[in-house]
């Protein structure tokens, strides 16, 4: 099991939507989910 | 909007491979996990592998591992999945899926 | 590996009443870290399959709030309030507790 990652569910979880304040801020990166870097948490 | 398009169809004959394509858009494609997904005719859904495109680094499906290779070319942001030594129970819709995201699929029909 | 399994079909429903569909894993799917690693996918007639909920009970973006999910390690449920016609299709839970990923055979959702 990929333990260098926080969950196991790195590979589906999908983008979360942002909360409503960060929603027009200039970092587009995922909040959740594969987006992370692939080198892990 | 985030893409991931599929060639419709292959008609490859046994014995023989085929390659098949998956082109990412929309979004960063070097970030993503992208999984390889079949389908038979009428059947469920199983899980083939899947390859981070900014390492190569792949994990597969143990039932595949001889049938299928999982490769990316960064520079066209497409991710590939050869299949080899085909046969009649390779013919099916397969997917290629980034999480929320799946591609068209492509109906490959293995047949003399 | 972890076996997924759903009834083929669900008990007809009509038009705007609830509908559930149940799903079994061979192993619980509820993890120390207090995550249960259930999903559930719908796949419409003719098209790819959609992520519909995600780690059991949370709903993926653009999904609709007639969908919920529950259920314990081992058993779960998808429910449907208010079916409607473009809920037709085929319901599929997987497992992303463990490689390989696995799906169960698919419930498909009958409208009377």
């Known amino acids: 099991q990929a333990t260098e990652y926080e969950y196991l569910d790195y590979d589906f979880l999908p983008e979360t939507e942002p909360p409503e304040m960060l929603r027009n801020s200039t970092d587009t990166t995922p909040l959740t989910g594969p987006g992370t870097p692939e080198s892990g948490k | 909007q985030v893409q991931l398009q599929q060639p419709g169809a292959e008609l490859v004959k046994p014995g023989a491979s085929v390659k098949l394509s998956c082109k990412a858009s929309g979004y960063t494609f070097t970030s993503y996990w992208m999984h390889w997904v079949k389908q038979r005719p009428g059947q469920g859904l199983e899980w083939i592998g899947m390859i981070h495109p900014n390492s190569g680094r792949t994990n597969y499906n143990e039932k595949f591992k001889s049938k299928a290779t999982l490769t990316v070319d960064k520079s066209s942001s497409t991710a590939y999945m050869q299949l080899s030594s085909l046969t009649s129970e390779d013919s099916a819709v397969y997917y290629c899926a980034r999480s929320d995201y799946w591609g068209q699929g492509t109906t490959l029909t293995v047949s003399s | 590996d972890i076996v997924m399994t759903q009834a083929a079909f669900s008990n007809p429903v009509t038009l705007g009443t609830s509908a559930s569909i149940s799903c079994r894993s061979s192993?619980?799917?509820?993890?120390?870290?207090?995550?249960?690693?259930l999903y559930w996918f719908l796949q419409r007639p003719g098209q790819s399959p959609q992520l519909l909920i995600y780690?059991?009970?949370n709903l993926a973006s653009g999904v609709p709030d007639r969908f919920s999910g529950s259920g314990s390690g081992t058993d779960f449920t998808l429910r449907i309030s208010r079916v409607e016609a473009e809920d037709v299709g085929v319901y599929y839970c997987?497992?992303?507790?463990?490689?390989?990923?696995?799906f169960g055979g698919g419930t498909k959702l009958e409208i009377k």
């Open positions: 192993k619980s799917l509820l993890h120390s870290d207090g995550i249960t690693y």
């Open positions: 997987a497992q992303m507790l463990e490689f390989p990923r696995t």
């Open positions: 780690r059991m009970s």
